[in-house]
C-alpha cells in the first residue's frame, strides 16, 4: 500500500490561493472554481513502500464550502 501522493510541484502556486473562501484553485485549468460540493479522496494509510507524490484523500469524502484548510498533515508541502 502506498502513501498518498507527495506535494507541491512546479505548477502549483504558493498558498494562499487567489480564490475567495468558497472557491478552490483548480490546477488543471489554473483558475478559481466553486468547490462547495466537491468530492475528493481521503488519505491512504501512510504505508510501506516508496513515498508517492502528494497526500491523497479517498473517494466519497465530502469537502464542504469552507475547504480552505487542509484537514490532514500534508508531508512535503513547500
Amino acid at each position: 500500500m502506498r502513501r498518498g501522493p507527495r506535494s507541491l510541484r512546479g505548477r502549483d502556486a504558493p498558498a494562499p490561493t487567489p480564490c475567495v473562501p468558497a472557491e478552490c484553485f483548480d490546477l488543471l485549468v489554473r483558475h478559481c472554481v466553486a468547490c462547495g460540493l466537491l468530492r475528493t479522496p481521503r488519505p491512504k494509510p501512510a504505508g510501506a513502500s516508496s513515498p508517492a507524490p502528494r497526500t491523497a484523500l479517498q473517494p466519497q469524502e465530502s469537502v464542504g464550502a469552507g475547504a480552505g484548510e487542509a484537514a490532514l498533515p500534508l508531508p512535503g508541502l513547500l
Partner: antibody, heavy 126, light 107 residues
C-alpha cells in the same frame, strides 16, 4: 455499486447529430466532474471534454470544439454529449468517465479518471 | 498540447516476468501522470495515479515511478490477467492527453 451506464450510440450520416447519455449510480453524481473520452478503431484514446460537478466549467479537445457540447442534469444523475456536424473521423467508441481529484487546502489536483462507462459505439458513415 | 510517447508499442512476455513500460512527456508534467489498463472490448481501468500511487483495489505487483518528463510502469511478476494494453495519461493541463499504448502479449 459505483457505475456509469451509457446509451445513445449508433450509425449516423456525416453532418448529422447524435446525443450520448451516461447514467450514474452508486455515488453522489452531482459532486464529481465528468469526462468524455473516445477511441477510434485501432487508435489511441482521445480526450473529448470535461464538465465540472456543477456544470459551471466546460473544456473541449480541439478536434470537437464548436461541434460537441458536454452537459449534465444532476437531478437525473446523467451526463450528456451532444454531437453536431458529425464527421467520418468522429467514428469511435465513446466513454464517459468520472473525474478523480484531490482537494489539498484550496487547491484541486487532478488524478485522471477513476470510474468508466462501458462505452458506446458511434459510426459516422454515408 | 503535451505529447506522451510510450515505449515499446508492444512487447511479448511470459507469466512471472518483470515488465517495464515507459512514458515520456514532451514537457515537464511534474507527477501528474496516470496509468490505465485496457482489455479488448472493455473500458480502461485506472491503475496508478500521480505517477506512483496505487489505485484502490489494484494488485501491488503494479508500481509507477518518475517525475518531470520520464515515467515508468512496472509489473513485478506478470500474471495471466495482466495481458492487456497499457496507457499513460497526463493531467497537468488541458487538453488532457494519452499515450498511444503498450500492448503486452503472451510470449
Amino acid at each position: 455499486e459505483v457505475q456509469l451506464v451509457q446509451s445513445g450510440g449508433g450509425v449516423v450520416q456525416p453532418g448529422r447529430s447524435l446525443r450520448l447519455s451516461c447514467a450514474a449510480s452508486g455515488f453522489t453524481f452531482g459532486s464529481y466532474g465528468m469526462h468524455w473520452v473516445r477511441q477510434a478503431p485501432g487508435k489511441c484514446l482521445e480526450w473529448v471534454a470535461v464538465i465540472w460537478y456543477d456544470g459551471s466549467n466546460k473544456y473541449y479537445g480541439d478536434s470537437v470544439k464548436g461541434r460537441f457540447t458536454i452537459s449534465r442534469d444532476n437531478s437525473k444523475n446523467t451526463l450528456y454529449l451532444q454531437m453536431n456536424s458529425l464527421r467520418d473521423e468522429d467514428t469511435a467508441v465513446y466513454y464517459c468517465a468520472r473525474r478523480f481529484t484531490h482537494l489539498r487546502g484550496q487547491y484541486i489536483e487532478d488524478y485522471g479518471m477513476d470510474v468508466w462507462g462501458q462505452g458506446t459505439t458511434v459510426t459516422v458513415s454515408s | 498540447e503535451i505529447v506522451l510517447t510510450q515505449s515499446p508499442s508492444s512487447l511479448s512476455a511470459s507469466v512471472g516476468d518483470r515488465v517495464t513500460i515507459t512514458c515520456r512527456a514532451s514537457q515537464s508534467i511534474s507527477s501528474y501522470l496516470n496509468w490505465y489498463q485496457q482489455k479488448p472490448g472493455k473500458a480502461p481501468k485506472l491503475l496508478i495515479y500521480a505517477a506512483s500511487s496505487l489505485q484502490s483495489g489494484v494488485p501491488s505487483r503494479f508500481s509507477g515511478s518518475g517525475s518531470g518528463t520520464d515515467f515508468t510502469l512496472t509489473i513485478s511478476s506478470l500474471q495471466p490477467e495482466d495481458f492487456a494494453t497499457y496507457y499513460c495519461q497526463q493531467s497537468y493541463s488541458t487538453p488532457l492527453t494519452f499515450g498511444c499504448g503498450t500492448k503486452v502479449e503472451i510470449k
